[in-house]
Every structure is written in C-alpha cells, then in structure tokens.
Amino acid sequence: HNTTVFQGVAGQSLQVSCPYDSMKHWGRRKAWCRQLGEKGPCQRVVSTHNLWLLSFLRRWNGSTAITDDTLGGTLTITLRNLQPHDAGLYQCQSLHGSEADTLRKVLVEVLADPLDHRDAGDLWFPGESESFEDAHVEHSISRSLLEGEIPFPPTS
C-alpha cells in the first residue's frame, strides 16, 4: 500500500477520506487505527457502528470521528481540534471476523497554526448568532508519499 499524506492545521479539524470498493467490502465494518512504530501493531482508535447497516452514523472516540458511506465506498475520519501529538501513521481498515484488511495507509501531518503568533486584535471571533461549527473550515491537503520517503524516522 502507498501512503497518503493528509495535512491539517493545529487547532482545526482534519478530514481523512479512504475510498474502497463498496462491493468487495460489502457488509464489513471499518476502523481507524494508529500504527505504533514501523513494524508495530495498529492500535484501534475508533470503528464504525456495530451494525453495518448503521455505518453511516458518526461514531466518536474522544476527538476522532468515523463514518462510512457504504454505497459510495468512502470511509471518512474526522480529527477534531488537531494537535501536534496527532501526527503519525494511521490505517483505514476493513474488518471481517477478527481480521482487518488495510484500505489505505495515512500519514497525518500537523502544521503550525499561522494565527498563533498574531496579536489578539487580529483574531476573528464569531458573532453571537454564528456558531463555530458553521464558521469552521476543514483543511485536508493530501498527497502520496514519494518513493524513498519514509513515514517513520529511522531508529538508531
């Protein structure tokens, strides 16, 4: 599997999409896991609804949400309030029995918030009638890792 890079801005939300063959993975629940080291296990962060028919319902674990468009074949993961410690290698998985097939390997990169060093006077605050949710822009810049690039720094 190639690794796709998704970049998000610290403090904002990042949306990761994992396309898949909807017929090949029909009836299978999905999961989002974090790779622990280059050869280590993938630790489950969140999985779709226990009933596959309800996979469209968004499920949260802390600040991470997952939802599955089983007809269109797109698994979507939202990382809310992105933090530097969220950076790393993840996988979108398709579950069958106790096994998991990798749908996509994802490298999450967290960019510094450009507003961090500005004066408070320069910051924009929503008015009373506006909600953060409505005003909120989700950044999701993705690319594939170039050949030779490695998602983990080499261990000494």
Epitope: G27, R28, W52, H96, G97
Partner: antibody, heavy 123, light 107 residues
C-alpha cells in the same frame, strides 16, 4: 438462481499440470469472493484459499501456498484452481464455494457450492 | 491456525430423536462459526451461520448456539433426510478451518 458449475473429473499422472474451473451464474460474479476447498477421500474439508474476482485479490492457506494457483476471469465469470506439477497426494474432490458476507457480524460464510471436481493422480 | 474439534465423531440416532453435536475452537472466535451438512457424493450445504442464524430454506428443526470457544448444533426432531455428515467451520481468521466432521447414522 445462483449456480456454481465446475469442470469435469480429471485423471492425471504425477508431474503433469492441471487447471480446473468454476463458472458462476445468477449473480454478480465479480462482487463475491470465491473459495476453493479440498476433500481427500473419506476425509474432512480443507480451505485452500479465496479470490475476489473483481480485482483478483487472493488469499492462500499456508498449507497450499506455493502448491496451487488460484485465479479468476471476471469477464467470463470463472474462477480457476491450477497445479504446475501434480502429486499422488493431490488426489481429492475439489469444491469451489461462494463466500457471502453477513452484514450482522461482518464475516463471511460459504452459501453456495459447486458440485465438485474429482481429481485423480496416479501413475 | 485455529483448530476446530467436533464431538462426537459419529452418532447413531432414530427418526424423531433430538441430537446435539458440539464444536470447540482452540481459541475464542466470538460468534464467527458456521455449520454445514454434507451427504455422500454431494457438496456441503450451509445450515447455520454466525453461530445461530438459520440459512434461508433450512428447516427450523436445526438450531445453533454458543460463542467464544464452545458451540452446538441441535436437530430437534430427526428426519430421514438429516442422516449425513456435519461440519463446523470458523470464520474468525485465515486460514478458515473446519472441524473433522460428525457422521449422523441411523440406529
């Protein structure tokens, strides 16, 4: 009506090659995994491997990896099981089976089976 | 690999009897288990999947139960057409594995 029709019985000599087939009809062949299962004379069932005809993604049992090749041609709704060099111990009945995922528990079960192909390997 | 062990290996019973066949997995497989019936010279037929779900067209005298490592197939009232060999199969992980079979014979 879902049907899996397998090719006829084969009698071969050790060292010969062989390719048997399993043709699906009555459903979208490319969209369901197809498994191959061996049954040696008077014995139980052994899962050999499985293929997704849509993209030819294949999984093998470690016991059969390197011994057989599983392939499929979705354009003619047919899966294949082949040997490059048969042994007397390959004498068995071979079944293909459709693997259907049950959405309630996200695992798959063999809901339709071919009639079987008897392969006899003898000098 | 997960080993599946069936007991008994064979059982003799009469029409109308209630028969129970057990299947034990070498490790927990949740409810990822199927039961098949095979008659001589024929392909296996799916009876039960997900441990307790009856396949379409299978008579209701067949039932399955269990989870984890221990499973049972019960035929509540044997009919003449039920004399056959029964196999359990785990759908938890690759490679898929079957029990060695239980032959149900007429007493």
């Amino acid at each position: 009506e879902v049907q899996l029709v397998q090719s006829g019985a084969e009698v071969k000599k050790p060292g010969e090659s062989l390719k048997i087939s399993c043709k699906g009809s009555g459903y979208s062949f490319a969209s369901y995994w197809i498994a191959w299962v061996r049954q040696m004379p008077g014995k139980g069932l052994e899962w050999m491997g499985t293929i997704y005809p849509g993209d030819s993604d294949t999984r093998y049992s470690p016991s059969f990896q390197g011994q057989v090749t599983i392939s499929a041609d979705k354009s003619i709704s047919t899966a294949y099981l082949q040997w490059s060099s048969l042994k007397a111990s390959d004498t068995a009945m071979y079944f293909c089976a459709r693997s259907r995922t049950f959405y309630y528990d996200s695992s798959d079960y063999f809901d339709y089976w071919g009639q079987g192909t008897l392969v006899t390997v003898s000098s | 690999d997960i080993q599946m062990t069936q007991s008994p290996s064979s059982v003799s019973a009469s029409v109308g009897d209630r028969v129970t066949i057990t299947c034990r997995a070498s490790q927990g497989i949740s409810s990822w288990l199927a039961w098949y019936q095979q008659k001589p010279g024929k392909a296996p037929k799916l009876l039960i999947y997900a441990a307790s779900w009856l396949q379409n067209g299978v008579p209701s005298r067949f039932s399955g139960s269990g989870s984890g490592t221990d499973f049972t197939l019960t035929i509540s009232s044997l009919q003449p057409e039920d004399f056959a060999t029964y196999f359990c199969q785990q759908a938890d992980s690759y490679p898929r594995t079957f029990g060695q079979g239980t032959k149900l014979e007429i007493k």
